[in-house]
């Protein structure tokens, strides 16, 4: 029977800036029950505070809710491991919240063949970004990543949006289903997942484009 | 602990290309994001660009664009840089650096001396 | 890019003294966070750098209180109050607020 073995902080993500949750993965037991306390204090002060939420964010987790996430402090935390053998602490981590962010993916991705008179028919589609962000603060800037395949294709076609919510596509493969899917990252964060796909038939009269891809 | 491991030194001829590694241990390496920063001798200090491992994200100084690239090899938990066309101007010695949740360096590695001679 | 200016360039002081870096910045370093990223790292001979000061004026873990930050917008200060031997290296400023990320030309703290 041993102390426990040195636990890890090994992520923390906040989806908006306005919460935030750490994990931390534990050493080894030393074949005894062993608890966790994971201890913080903010820049400029020499007060420790115990984690308010260690419910939300799941096993081995520490959850910030509003009242307790500032954007403007950084969090130095470690992580306790106790057990009737003795102690062992994680390394302390630096913690600002900007560079935490990890958002929802978009929202209300359509997509649509257009096939005007004058010019060559193109793929267009646009998308919302996640509720939770609040672009008008200009706290976040956020970039968009589109990628889409023919339904049956094994390998992925990707296109960097920078921050338009909007996009055109104009070389497509006539006849093909294709499946379409955006995320999004800011400036300083993390990419969101994935968001659902959107399906879309492109018509087998679509005419060819020798250019790639266009920005609005 | 966290550690970053840096070979010494590279010998490289002119209008070449190196590839330099820095070995992470001591925490999981696609949890945080590692840096790249170059050191001419005497001289001060220059932040090259930034790879998150978990997706191989990076995002580059536009004076490093087509000098240095930057890839991980999550296996090894390694990061690599390389630089290529070297010149007598890339001498120097060159860091890996990495932050914790923050956009400053907590850890650095020991450094790899490049040497750009024929 | 952000250029950052340090003074001076070589700082011999006696040991015991106090010394003050200064260190100037091309663009006002408030990041639209509202956080100020300007950090201060010391590199001592055949060493890596070291993370003294992060965010203006806080202390990196195991930095010894004599070490201290100040400033804003434009104008950073790095005071060490009493030099001890250890103190002796390469100072360098840095800024993390606009990318690129950009560092003084360092200031060498010698024995005088």
């Known amino acids: 029977q041993l102390p426990p073995g040195k636990p890890e902080i090994f992520k923390c993500r906040s989806p908006n800036k306005e919460t935030f949750t750490c994990w931390w993965r534990p050493g080894t037991d030393g074949g005894l029950p062993t608890n966790y306390s994971l201890t913080y204090h903010r820049e400029g002060e020499t007060l420790m505070h115990e984690c308010p939420d260690y419910i939300t964010g799941g096993p081995n987790s520490c959850h910030f809710g509003k009242q307790y996430t500032s954007m403007w402090r950084t969090y130095v935390m470690m992580v306790n491991a106790t057990n009737q053998m003795g102690s062992s602490f994680s390394d302390e981590l630096y913690v600002d919240v900007t560079y935490i962010v990890q958002p929802d993916p978009p929202l209300e991705l359509t997509v649509e063949v257009k096939q005007p008179e004058d010019r060559k028919p193109y793929l267009w589609m646009k998308w919302s970004p996640p509720t939770l962000i609040d672009l008008k603060t200009g706290w976040f800037t956020l970039l968009y990543e589109i990628r889409l395949k023919p339904e049956k294709a094994a390998e992925w076609e990707t296109h960097f949006a920078g921050q338009q919510t909007e996009f055109k596509i104009l070389s497509l493969h006539p006849g093909q289903k294709y499946l379409v899917q955006v995320r999004c990252k800011p400036d300083h964060g993390y990419w969101s997942a994935w968001s659902p796909a959107t399906f879309i038939q492109i018509p087998s009269d679509f005419i060819m484009n020798d250019h790639h891809h266009h920005h609005h | 602990q966290v550690q970053l491991q840096q070979p010494g030194a590279e010998l490289v001829r002119p209008g070449t290309s190196v590839k330099l590694s820095c070995k992470a241990s001591g925490y999981t390496f696609t949890s945080f994001w590692m840096h790249w920063v170059k050191q001419r001798p005497g001289q001060g200090l220059e932040w090259i660009g930034v790879?998150?491992?978990?997706?191989?994200?990076?995002n580059y100084n536009q004076k490093f664009k087509g000098k240095a690239t930057l890839t991980v090899d999550t296996s090894s938990s390694t990061a690599y840089m390389q630089l290529s066309s070297l010149t007598s101007e890339d001498s120097a010695v060159y860091y890996c650096?990495?932050?914790?949740?923050?956009?400053?360096?907590?850890?650095w590695g020991q450094g790899t001396l490049v040497t750009v001679s024929a | 890019d952000v250029v950052m200016t340090q003074t001076p360039l070589s700082l011999p002081v006696s040991l015991g003294d106090q010394a003050s870096i200064s260190c100037r910045s091309s663009q006002r370093l408030v990041h639209s966070n509202g956080n100020t990223y300007l950090h201060w790292y010391l590199q001592k001979p055949g060493q890596s750098p070291k993370l003294l000061i992060y965010k203006v004026s806080n202390r990196f873990s195991g930095v010894p209180d004599r070490f201290s930050g100040s400033g804003s917008g434009t104008d950073f200060t790095l005071k060490i109050s009493r030099v001890e031997a250890e103190d002796l290296g390469v100072y360098f400023c840095s800024q993390s607020t606009h990318v690129p990320w950009t560092f003084g030309g360092g200031t060498k703290l010698e024995i005088k």
């Open positions: 790879i998150d491992p978990s997706d191989t994200y990076t």
């Open positions: 650096a990495r932050g914790d949740y923050s956009n400053w360096f907590t850890y």
